[in-house]
Amino acid sequence: EPPTACREKQYLINSQCCSLCQPGQKLVSDCTEFTETECLPCGESEFLDTWNRETHCHQHKYCDPNLGLRVQQKGTSETDTICTCEEGWHCTSEACESCVLHRSCSPGFGVKQIATGVSDTICEPCPVGFFSNVSSAFEKCHPWTSCETKDLVVQQAGTNKTDVVCGPQDRLR
């Protein structure tokens, strides 16, 4: 009786179970009653990452430098190439098909999390007592200067974009 289902790593064709090709190999011809499935290794710059019956291997991803991409991990016959972005850039999607420049945090905002090749800069507003007076992808919010520790007094209050201005204490006459 011909099978209706096959074991793992097999597929059903012409009423018989044939072995799938292993990762890194493509299907050349289906098995018969006399021969096993014929498979061939993927060529240079090609891959297949699963047990399969594909007649063509997939091309490795190209990390296009014109899009800000570079190779993070070279592909093999069983794995695709993994791209990442050049320094100062990050991927626009999980597939990392293109890159954009890391966002800078505007004055009044500091860097909460520095960008990576796959994630953008995360900014946060500077809370009371902290400031940022530059647009930066690296600078955190800085604490206001403590005038007291310098034996000075606050002459001008700080904001989220400016530090306090300290000055000498008024002398008692």
Partner: antibody
Framework: EVQLVESGGGVVQPGRSLRLSCAAS????????MSWVRQAPGKGLEWVAS????????YYPDNVKGRCTISRDNSKNTLYLQMNSLRAEDTAVYYC??????????WGQGTLVTVSS | EIVLTQSPATLSLSPGERATLSCRAS??????LHWYQQKPGQAPRLLIN???QSISGIPARFSGSGSGTDFTLTISSLEPEDFAVYFC?????????FGQGTKVEIK
């Protein structure tokens, strides 16, 4: 008990034709692929032809393609090999074999074909 | 076409000795190889399939190993009835091909 009995061999002149038969018994013939394998005197084994269980698919090596035709009659449990334009190098014992688990798991006793003028 | 090369062509041994027969494929055939035994005046019989799988009714002294391009048939202790010719056969792809055979003879 599985049995394969070949017949039809004999002496034949070059250029002539011959049809070999193989009577199968002891198993469900229509469930198995079948093959012919030959062996020249004192030589090794050489695959000649194969046919799928249903008879739809046939396979041949290049050196016999176009000269040999494998066929089967599942209602008669019989395998055939039609050989045309015979040559001296076709002289051999011809074995009928059953394909079980992709191996030739049962063989007939063979029939001798001699091509000679 | 996949070419199978068997070695040695002849193996001269005494009963009780261990026989090691080699079959080398011209390209990788994974484990898609069978072994057959043929005695004089008889048809071949299947000994081992898929390179190492034993066949019902075949004595346990016969074993096969190997994968890819290099295969071995081992007879652990030769019995008088084991002196015969042994053939390997690949079923990885068409055309089906056999090795030229190894004759195991009595020393």
């Amino acid at each position: 008990e599985v049995q394969l009995v070949e017949s039809g061999g004999g002496v034949v002149q070059p250029g002539r034709s011959l049809r070999l038969s193989c009577a199968a018994s002891g198993f469900t013939f229509s469930n198995y692929g079948m093959s012919w394998v030959r062996q020249a005197p004192g030589k090794g084994l050489e695959w000649v032809a194969s046919i799928s269980s249903g008879g739809d698919d046939t396979y041949y090596p290049d050196n016999v393609k176009g000269r040999c035709t494998i066929s089967r009659d599942n209602s008669k449990n019989t395998l055939y090999l039609q050989m045309n334009s015979l040559r001296a190098e076709d002289t051999a014992v011809y074995y009928c074999t059953r394909a079980g688990g992709k191996a030739m798991d049962y063989w007939g006793q063979g029939t001798l074909v001699t091509v000679s003028s | 076409e996949i070419v199978l090369t068997q070695s040695p062509a002849t193996l001269s041994l005494s009963p009780g000795e261990r026989a090691t027969l080699s079959c080398r494929a011209s390209q990788s055939i994974r484990d898609n190889l069978h072994w057959y035994q043929q005695k004089p005046g008889q048809a071949p019989r299947l000994l081992i399939n898929y390179a190492s799988q034993s066949i019902s009714g075949i004595p346990a002294r016969f074993s096969g190993s190997g994968s890819g391009t290099d295969f071995t048939l081992t007879i652990s202790s030769l019995e008088p009835e084991d002196f015969a010719v042994y053939f390997c056969q690949q079923f990885n792809s068409w055309p089906l091909t056999f090795g030229q055979g190894t004759k195991v003879e009595i020393k």
